[in-house]
């Protein structure tokens, strides 16, 4: 939702969490603010306070249950509103119609831990976290490796286009130290975006063996 | 192997209750929503409803709310279809399938109701 | 309730050529489309999600596309295992709805 210079946006974890940010240029940093959530069938709502996290923009995250609990399905719809505090009154400042199942962003994997490793290959699994059993095994994973004397916007992104938890990166060189880095998306959403970028994996290949050709 | 079977083919007099069973095998049954789809002669294919197996929560479409119930027992892996106060109009097959909330990923064999005086 | 119409109801297309069944959705669904293939006598079964994405095990000459809210869905040398009811299904709005099916018959 946008208005003039402000901007609402919202993603769904896909389980018991939305996360937002609200940015407006000029607002006052020390006004309060919140986020109101109020689903159209539901007998709950949810409030979270809004938090600077720069010069104009705020966010925070509304917890709707346990992490894996499953609080909203495809078909709500929750009405989220900014409110901000002027002096004993509340200001509505941002409002928008948000279907959480079109507007999502899952956790970043977790679990990344290697399977087994030799002198030119690797091979890494991890696991998805707090994701929705609605999603089946319609996702698709983006990897990345980090090699020495590179920066991660320098790696190739690898595609995965199912649910697959684990890769076998090849072509690796002996001896040398790498990091490895996933995130995941639903097939599912107008606006769904990817995932974090996981913790990164460090781990290092095995030397060539002495006097052999490599 | 994914697989949906369904009780055998019923007939019913106008005003009766017809439920349809729907056993599963292959899968996790709780992590699974199991949708029932009514397709009537004339009347193609209709989305009846669904039920979450992982915390019993339905949804029904609008048209059938008021006289169906899907029900699922996690013990025997079984989702059933209650329909209540039958015409002659409910005369059709009935699906059961599994999948997310979107689409229908795996269906079972189908189930025929005729009502009929 | 969102309302697909499917066109044309029959088409008659000889095997091994290419055939284009179009789906067209009453308002803006994104890509929230999905197809299936129903034979006689059996249940449907799921092609394509998402207006194009192919599910496994479904053949490649099976694809889909999508220009704003008309969809195709397009077989591109028909084997006689082809020959099927095809419905399309939104999934934007509850309740998800079907199209009325477009029956493709061997010419």
């Known amino acids: 939702a946008v208005n003039g210079t402000s901007r609402f946006t919202c993603f769904y974890n896909s389980r018991a969490n939305i996360s937002c940010v609200w940015s407006q240029d000029g607002a006052l940093q020390d006004t309060s603010c919140q986020v109101h959530a109020w689903p159209d069938r539901r007998r709950w709502n949810q409030t979270c306070e809004l938090l600077p996290v720069s010069q104009a923009s705020w966010a925070c995250n509304l917890i709707l249950g346990t992490p894996d609990s499953q609080k909203l399905t495809a078909v709500d719809i929750v009405t989220l509103r900014v409110m901000c505090r002027e002096g004993v009154r509340w200001r509505m400042m941002a409002i928008q119609d948000f279907k959480p199942f079109e507007n999502l962003r899952l956790m970043a994997p977790i679990s990344l831990q290697v399977v087994h490793v030799e002198t030119h290959r690797c091979n890494i699994s991890w696991k998805i976290s707090q994701a929705s059993h609605y999603f089946e095994r319609h996702l698709e994973f983006e990897a990345r490796t980090l090699s020495p004397g590179h920066t991660w916007e320098e790696a190739p992104l690898m595609t995965l286009k199912q649910k697959q938890e684990w890769i076998c990166l090849e072509t690796l060189t002996p001896d040398t130290q790498y990091e490895f880095q996933v995130r995941v998306k639903p097939l599912q959403g107008e606006f769904t975006t990817w995932s974090p970028w996981s913790q990164p994996l460090a781990f290092r290949t095995k030397p060539a063996a002495l006097g052999k050709d490599t | 192997e994914v697989q949906l079977v369904q009780s055998g083919a019923e007939v019913k007099k106008p005003g009766a209750t017809v439920k349809i069973s729907c056993k599963v095998s292959g899968f996790n049954f709780k992590d699974s929503l199991m949708h029932w789809v009514q397709q009537a002669p004339g009347k193609g294919l209709e989305w009846m409803g669904w039920?979450?197996?992982?915390?019993?929560?339905?949804e029904y479409a609008p048209g059938f709310q008021d006289r169906v119930t899907i029900t699922a027992d996690t013990s025997t892996d079984t989702a059933y279809m209650e329909l209540s106060s039958l015409r002659s109009e409910d005369t059709a097959v009935y699906y059961c399938?599994?999948?997310?909330?979107?689409?229908?990923?795996?269906w079972g064999q189908g189930t025929t109701v005729t009502v009929s005086s | 309730e969102i309302v697909m119409t499917q066109s044309p109801a029959t088409l008659s297309v000889s095997p091994g050529e290419r055939a284009t069944l179009s789906c067209r959705a009453s308002q803006i669904i994104s890509n929230n489309l999905h197809w299936y293939q129903q034979k006689p006598g059996q249940a449907p079964r799921l092609l394509i999600i998402?207006?194009?994405q192919s599910i496994s095990g479904i053949p490649a000459r099976f694809s889909g596309s999508r220009s704003g809210t008309e969809f195709t869905l397009t077989i591109s040398s028909l084997q006689s295992e082809d020959f099927a009811v095809y419905f399309c299904?939104?999934?934007?709005?509850?309740?998800?709805?079907f199209g009325q099916g477009t029956k493709l018959e061997i010419k």
């Open positions: 998402y207006g194009l």
């Open positions: 039920i979450d197996s992982e915390n019993g929560e339905t």
């Open positions: 299904q939104q999934s934007n709005n509850w309740p998800y709805t």
């Open positions: 399938a599994r999948g997310g909330p979107w689409f229908l990923s795996y």
